[in-house]
């Protein structure tokens, strides 16, 4: 066959679906690789072809669209499973072609089993709720396009294994789950089960997401430098090791990049000739506030090093902060036999 633009295996889109549930999978070509949509391609005379490679096999084979009850079908740029089976797992390829043009991409599809409490190897999306922020909602994800708007599904929400009924601050409202005032105790996995009829059959869609309660923007402040501070003086003799921690607290801020860095005489440590090492550690609170520590270390400090300015800097979306460490050279203790004896009038 003639050359085909092969985008390879798109592992970025690792698609996971539950066994024995409907799944609709759009051909990634139109979403991520080509600059035109399916309608444009179709009206230009291009045909979309699907095939697959079973798990642990190398052989590409056509997808059987003649299964009982149309279990697998294609509609425009969507591949449908009504429902999936465990052995549907494999790499699926969609190819767009005519006599002069060809483009294809493969993607992995994994059919996953779940237990009665919805536990599974499925990678769960995380939804962050602000602590004590007022009413916030999560929406049952990825259910669009499964049934027409005329169909009214039933939706049941669960927290972990338990159906959400008469919960203090969590209220199911159809496709939405409302949190009246989110608390740490609301952390956990939430599952919506959407049940709908189609052609005399009943289908279930199970969607689980992780809720993580995080610090509220109402409480967010610029970074706070705990160290260095005004109370600690780094007094060293030449030849000793100088260790200065820069410890910074960051409020949780959605999509904020937290940065900590040292400057020595106004320059980044990489840009100066002294032998300095920086070690960083990061810890998080239950609400994802962050504490970063960068320890500046000079193994054998010189008297010149003890005259330099060591400044800890930090920045988040809320602002920039800086604090200079108090570094000085230790005045050597007098040697008794010479200095003190002279002081007592010895000659």
């Amino acid at each position: 066959s003639e050359r085909c633009d092969d985008w390879g295996l798109d592992t970025m889109r690792q698609i996971q679906v539950f066994e024995d549930e409907p799944a609709r999978i759009k051909c990634p070509l139109f979403e991520h690789f080509l600059k035109f949509n399916y309608s444009t391609a179709h009206s230009a005379g291009l045909t979309l072809i699907w095939y697959w490679t079973r798990q642990d096999r190398d052989l590409e084979e056509p997808i059987n669209f003649r299964l009982p009850e149309n279990r697998i079908s294609k509609e425009k740029d969507v591949l449908w499973f009504r429902p999936t089976l465990l052995n549907d797992t494999g790499n699926y390829t969609c190819m767009l072609r005519n006599t002069t043009y060809c483009s294809k991409v493969a993607f992995p599809l994994e059919v996953v089993q779940k237990d009665s409490c919805f536990n599974s190897p499925m990678k769960l999306p995380v939804h962050k709720l602000y602590i004590e922020y007022g009413i916030q909602r999560i929406t049952c994800p990825n259910v669009d396009g499964y049934f027409p708007s005329s169909v009214k599904p039933t939706i049941t929400w669960y927290m972990g294994c338990y159906k959400i009924q008469n919960f203090n601050n969590v209220i199911p409202e159809g496709m939405n789950l409302s949190f009246l005032i989110a608390l740490i105790s609301n952390n956990g996995n939430y599952t919506c089960v959407v049940t709908y009829p189609e052609n005399g059959r009943t289908f279930h869609l199970t969607r689980t997401l992780t809720v993580k309660v995080v610090g509220s923007p109402k409480n967010a402040v610029p970074p706070v430098i705990h160290s260095p501070n005004d109370h600690v003086v780094y007094e060293k003799e030449p030849g000793e090791e100088l260790l200065i921690p820069c410890t910074v607290y960051f409020s949780f801020l959605m999509d904020s990049r937290n940065e900590v860095w040292w400057t020595i005489d106004g320059k980044k440590p990489d840009d100066i000739t002294i032998d300095v090492t920086i070690n960083e550690s990061i810890s998080h609170s239950r609400t994802e506030d962050e504490t970063r520590t960068q320890i500046l270390s000079i193994k054998k400090v010189t008297s010149e090093d003890l005259k330099r300015s060591y400044v800890c800097h930090a920045r988040s979306a809320k602002g920039e902060v800086a604090k200079a460490a108090k570094v000085k050279q230790k005045v050597p203790a007098p040697r008794y036999t010479v200095e003190l004896a002279c002081g007592f009038g010895a000659t």
């Epitope: 706070v224 005489d265 330099r308 060591y310 602002g319 800086a322 604090k323 200079a324």
Partner: antibody, heavy 116, light 110 residues
Framework: SVEESGGRLVTPGTPLTLTCTVS????????MGWVRQAPGKGLEWIGI?????SIYYASWAKGRFTISKTSTTVDLKMTSLTTEDTATYFC??????????????WGQGTLVTVSS | DIVMTQTPSPVSGAVGGTVTIKCQAS??????LAWYQQKPGQPPKLLIY???TLESGVPSRFKGSRSGTDYTLTISDLESADAATYYC????????????FGGGTEVVVK
Amino acid sequence: SVEESGGRLVTPGTPLTLTCTVSGFSLDSYAMGWVRQAPGKGLEWIGIINSYGSIYYASWAKGRFTISKTSTTVDLKMTSLTTEDTATYFCARSAYSNNGDRLHLWGQGTLVTVSS
Amino acid sequence: DIVMTQTPSPVSGAVGGTVTIKCQASEDIYSNLAWYQQKPGQPPKLLIYYVSTLESGVPSRFKGSRSGTDYTLTISDLESADAATYYCQCTEGGSGSDYTFGGGTEVVVK
């Protein structure tokens, strides 16, 4: 930008409030300081308010000067004014949230004249 | 309170030459020192902070250094535009009284 206003001629003992209006940035992210300069004299530190709302005053200013802020203004309230308080009052923004170690954006100043 | 003592004033230098301004703190203020330049009728302009860090846009002819409680601002390749009064400022920061300015040093460019 930062712009001071409220400076005028007042008699001794009169209270006066100066306002520093900021635009293009949020006071939630920057410390703001007040500095004054008597005619022909040097700069004199008055005080600072950082982004967390902590306020620090020069020892000579404590009790007579009060710094406060709203979302877009920083006020300097002065009481018991004397002729020694005649000066141009500057408002300045720090590059940092936590301190006035780097006052890099200054207003043009507002003149306060205390005279009987 | 920390006292900042600036010397000498005035100081003069020729175009292309070098001038040195000294500032002494009454106690150890470590790296907490800034330098400002002020011209008549204008607000101060930050030149250097944390002893030796140049504010962006300030030419590298301006250099700050420290030895104990003595701080120095050196201006090399002097230009006529450098004629101004220069102030050191303690930025010790623990309390408001620790943001004291020095008395200022006038630089005359001949």
